[in-house]
Amino acid sequence: ELCDDDPPEIPHATFKAMAYKEGTMLNCECKRGFRRIKSGSLYMLCTGNSSHSSWDNQCQCTSSATRNTTKQVTPQPEEQKERKTTEMQSPMQPVDQASLPGHCREPPPWENEATERIYHFVVGQMVYYQCVQGYRALHRGPAESVCKMTHGKTRWTQPQLICTGEMETSQFPGEEKPQASPEGRPESETSCLVTTTDFQIQTEMAATMETSIFTTEYQ
């Protein structure tokens, strides 16, 4: 089931999924001056079977001025600069996200894609937060949020993160150990079934990460 909304916004922080659950949708959007090819897909969809997950459909952009050029190539470094990131790009590669059953890795860029990626997450998806450059993380608990189904409605848990305006940057997913396990987080509704998945596996995976490229910015 798709989550009703985006993860919560934390001032001066960005969120990022390490891997995307099957059912996740990604908008195929193009930057200004470009548009989707005629009859091109509006979305990519993470699909799969028991052994392998991958993104269905391809996003393709073409110049708004010309109708006959279609390109789908990895952008040059100068083109990639246009994508919004937190400037903490590291040569270190993330853990192999394909090793997480039922999940897709981050789709590769497509030429002339929009400056920001728009994902539609599903129940059970976990995202991780990090303070933007120039802000320091103060943790009261896990700097993550998970989309849960409660009483037939979806909601995101509140990440326990405050970003203070100090000049030192913190490591991802947090320089301090979380004070509470994800399961120990207080819930507003305890009288009904709560559907959660992937806490353990995603938390372990995140612990192996030192840095990550973020493409979602706090607005």
Epitope: D6, N27, R36, L42, Y43, A114, T115, I118
Partner: antibody, heavy 115, light 108 residues
Amino acid sequence: QVQLVQSGAEVKKPGSSVKVSCKASGGTFSRYPINWVRQAPGQGLEWMGRIIPILGIADYAQRFQGRVTITADKFTNTAYMELSSLRSEDTAVYYCARRDWGDYWGQGTLVTVSS
Amino acid sequence: EIVLTQSPGTLSLSPGERATLSCRASQSVSSSFLAWYQQKPGQAPRLLIYGASSRATGIPDRFSGSGSGTDFTLTISRLEPEDFAVYYCQQYSSSPLTFGGGTKVEIK
């Protein structure tokens, strides 16, 4: 709970323009597509176009291209649809809807074009 | 553009009966990006099904969607009095988004 509240009914003369607003509250606005769909009296639903507020780029149905302008203000969580060169056939209820599969809809705005 | 054709145009049934509505696409709807809506007079459409088979929040389980490619079906297992309305299918696989012409489910 997500709510989309649209501006009130309008009566317009042929050749003029109308601008309908759609204010969102209670959920994600700037990162999800806002679509505009119209329904003429006794007819079906017709998609006009969409915008993703955070990107500010709109996408229009071919038949409305050049006559419709969709904009959004992500600070006030409001989307706008302006239709120009109005004719009597544009008399319809105009709806805004969040996401491309319309998970939430505005209540509709009746636009009557009459001389 | 993808043209959606709904059938029948009108379905006359009694409460308690099963309703089967069809939506056929002129070309394949990728990844089953198809939605179903219910609309009652004077009201905005209400999302019932997205992704061809996923029920929207708060929709009773008597509503179910199925199909892929070019043929999709909305089934109402046991019609309740409040289910008599017009039903639309819509694809969001590619732009322009398109709707079917609608099926009116009326009381027999």
